[in-house]
């Protein structure tokens, strides 16, 4: 959470941003809020990126103006125009690229004054893991798969029954480059699993942490997955 202040004569407004992460190839949001102003035509929003000449996006007089936009953002940006009057200057970013990572500035000018705040935007790839029982294996094993990760994550297994056990000797993890040559598919196999136990496959890089749980009993298989972005907010 970053709060910035600006001074215009005697007037300053508070601008607030949140550090966030973007998933390559998906759509992202760079969050920014400011003190609302009912005079839409008097609001100017500028998004800038450190090291880039030109703007990421500009919204003024109630509409977009991309005449100064840097070409790397062409066709990929928009503000939530109907929410600007209530103080939302967040930026939509289409088709997030690895090169979109960096420091952004959200600059606001209204009839009340002006202000700005920076945010760090991280980019990578992260996805939910899915665990299945691998019945083809000679001994009962679990297969944990996640389709898109970058940078290369670490993978670890855990078990409810054998808490603290190191499963690295009885697991095998591989990383397969996807067709776009950036992200990778993660596959990890855990061997010699026992029935009536809950196993967890944990995949983590510096952007996200994902966990897949599976409980195998004689009568059923229960699964659960969750994904958490790291250092956000």
């Amino acid at each position: 959470l970053i709060i910035g202040f600006g001074i215009s004569g005697k007037h300053f407004i508070t601008v607030t941003t949140f550090t966030s992460a973007g998933n390559i190839g998906e759509d992202g949001t760079l969050s920014c809020t400011f003190e609302p102003d009912i005079k839409l035509n008097g609001i100017v929003i500028q998004w800038l990126k450190e090291g880039i000449k030109g703007l990421v996006h500009e919204f003024k007089e109630g509409k977009d103006d991309l005449s100064q936009q840097h070409e790397m953002f062409r066709g990929r940006t928009a503000v939530f125009a109907d929410q600007v009057v209530v103080g939302n200057a967040s930026l939509r970013l289409k088709n997030v690229q690895l090169t979109d990572a960096g420091t952004y500035t959200c600059y606001i000018r209204t009839s009340k004054g002006k202000g700005n705040a920076n945010l760090e935007y991280k980019t990578g790839a992260f996805s939910m893991p899915e665990i299945n029982v691998d019945y083809n294996a000679s001994s009962e094993s679990l297969r944990c798969e996640a389709p898109r990760w970058f940078p290369q994550p670490t993978v670890a297994w855990a078990s409810q029954v054998d808490q603290g056990a190191n499963f690295s000797e009885v697991s095998n993890t591989s990383f397969e480059l996807n067709s776009e040559n950036v992200t990778m598919k993660v596959v990890s196999v855990l061997y010699n699993v026992t029935i009536n136990n809950t196993y967890s496959c944990m995949i983590e890089n510096d952007i996200a942490k994902a966990t897949g749980d599976i409980k195998v009993t004689d009568s059923e298989v229960k699964r659960r997955s969750q994904l958490q972005l790291l250092n956000s907010g």
Partner: antibody, heavy 121, light 107 residues
Framework: QLQLQESGPGLVKPSETLSLTCTAS??????????WSWIRQHPGKGLEWIGN???????YYNPSLKSRVTMSVDTSKNQFSLKLSSVTAADTAVYYC?????????????WGRGTLVTVSS | DIQMTQSPSSVSASVGDRVTITCRAS??????LAWYQQKPGKAPKLLIY???SLQSGVPSRFSGSGSGTDFTLTISSLQPEDFATYYC?????????FGGGTKVEIK
Amino acid sequence: QLQLQESGPGLVKPSETLSLTCTASGGSISHGGYYWSWIRQHPGKGLEWIGNIYYSGSTYYNPSLKSRVTMSVDTSKNQFSLKLSSVTAADTAVYYCARESSTISADFDLWGRGTLVTVSS
Amino acid sequence: DIQMTQSPSSVSASVGDRVTITCRASQGISRWLAWYQQKPGKAPKLLIYAASSLQSGVPSRFSGSGSGTDFTLTISSLQPEDFATYYCQQAHTFPYTFGGGTKVEIK
């Protein structure tokens, strides 16, 4: 209500330059919320996006045509134009001008009627 | 470039039929897909944007679904004015590309 209308020669000789203009009426192409595109359709075939232009004059061209395409805009006349050089029979098509529905959406919500350009000697 | 593959290339149907057209992208495009209707001698008309959003003025019998690489256009009850060619278009990555089209003909 905004309307688009293409104009230009219907017949162009091989190796010459195809020139088309799209005139907007009932609205301004200087509205910052839109990109303006050219799209073509070969006879009986599918659609091919040629490129787009912003009111400020910045452009993006389809790499397959980039070496031959030039787009320009004249906001005082509320027009934008397409030039395609060194044409061959393969450039015979109906050419459409169109509006992208927003700065991010890149779907085409408003089209001209289209103009058939034949490349022949 | 992202390739857009439509199927079938043509379909014969009767008034009142439910018609489904599919479009597959060669790589993930999230929900950045549009559908158009084109009648002979006319410009294409936008029906669906963002995979499932109905363009203003388009009848509710048209619907779109899908995300990632696989998308569907459905006409719930075919009307006489719906006989036309339909195109999908990816709006995710430059250069924007269209599918080859699906012609909906009278059976």
